[in-house]
């Protein structure tokens, strides 16, 4: 539910409550959609997306697609629902606070994807192997 | 504790334009997160815009960007949305709500956290 004076709808995503009933802020998440990107062989880059989005739905997180083709490399990014598959994966590090790049097999690219969950975190994204989640610590964040 | 009170809505002809007004009681204004939000007739909350406390950064919905400007003065404990070249799909009641660092839910039934409301009618 929402504050009393707030009608109820039925039915509609746009609300997320936790077992309370108190209603969940949205995501702010970098969403530019699909850009061409500099972005090579570094540990990490910034987006360098102007645009900071609020999420249409409480429930979304942010996202990031990273692709690497014969022609060019582009990134994407966006809110979406980890309930839903994003280019027919699942986003299973959703809950971490950091976007931590995973390849993800396509065929005829090279293909990463992250997902976060805290304001703006698909604006740095990072690919370097010492921000992997066998790291402990990064696993504590997450989970807490 | 802030108290939120919304003022400026009204009747309006598509492609026109309102200023909302919020004004806070309290002299906690400075510490939140301000946002408007809205919610069209049997429909779900939409979190329109919101605006940061230091810096005035500002955030908007894909749905407003470019028609929509918030803006605060934390002199006067207000927060304001402009809103331009309104359509009928802008009809709804809108809402301030504020949030503290690192909030991420706002309590049901709290006054303080929510306004009542100011209704804008996009209709020719």
């Known amino acids: 539910t929402i504050p009393p004076h707030v009608q109820k709808s039925v039915n509609n995503d746009m609300i997320v409550t936790d077992n309370n009933g108190a209603v969940k802020f949205p995501q702010l998440c970098k969403f530019c959609d699909v850009r061409f990107s500099t972005c090579d062989n570094q540990k990490s880059c910034m987006s360098n997306c102007s645009i900071t989005s609020i999420c249409e739905k409480p429930q979304e997180v942010c996202v990031a697609v990273w692709r690497k083709n014969d022609e060019n490399i582009t990134l994407e990014t966006v809110c979406h629902d980890p309930k839903l598959p994003y280019h027919d994966f699942i986003l299973e590090d959703a809950a971490s606070p950091k976007c931590i790049m995973k390849e993800k097999k396509k065929p005829g690219e090279t293909f990463f994807m992250c997902s976060c969950s805290s304001d703006e975190c698909n604006d740095n994204i990072i690919f370097s192997e010492e921000y992997n989640t066998s790291n402990p610590d990064l696993l504590l964040v997450i989970f807490q | 504790e802030v108290q939120l009170l919304e003022s400026g809505g009204g009747l309006v002809q598509p492609g026109g334009s309102l200023r909302l007004s919020c004004a806070a009681s309290?002299?906690?204004?400075?510490?939140?997160r301000m946002w408007w939000v809205r919610q069209a007739p049997g429909k779900g909350l939409e979190w329109v815009s919101a605006i940061e406390p230091i810096g005035h950064r500002t955030y908007y919905a894909n749905s407003v960007r470019g028609r929509f400007t918030i803006s605060r003065d934390n002199s006067k404990n207000t927060l304001y949305l402009q809103m331009n070249s309104l359509r009928a799909e802008d009809t709804a009641v809108y809402y301030c709500?504020?949030?503290?660092?690192?909030?991420?839910?706002?309590?049901?039934?709290?006054?303080?956290?929510w306004g009542q409301g100011t209704l804008v009618t996009v209709s020719s």
């Open positions: 709500a504020k949030q503290a660092p690192n909030q991420r839910y706002v309590a049901r039934g709290r006054l303080d956290y």
């Open positions: 309290g002299s906690t204004f400075t510490e939140y």
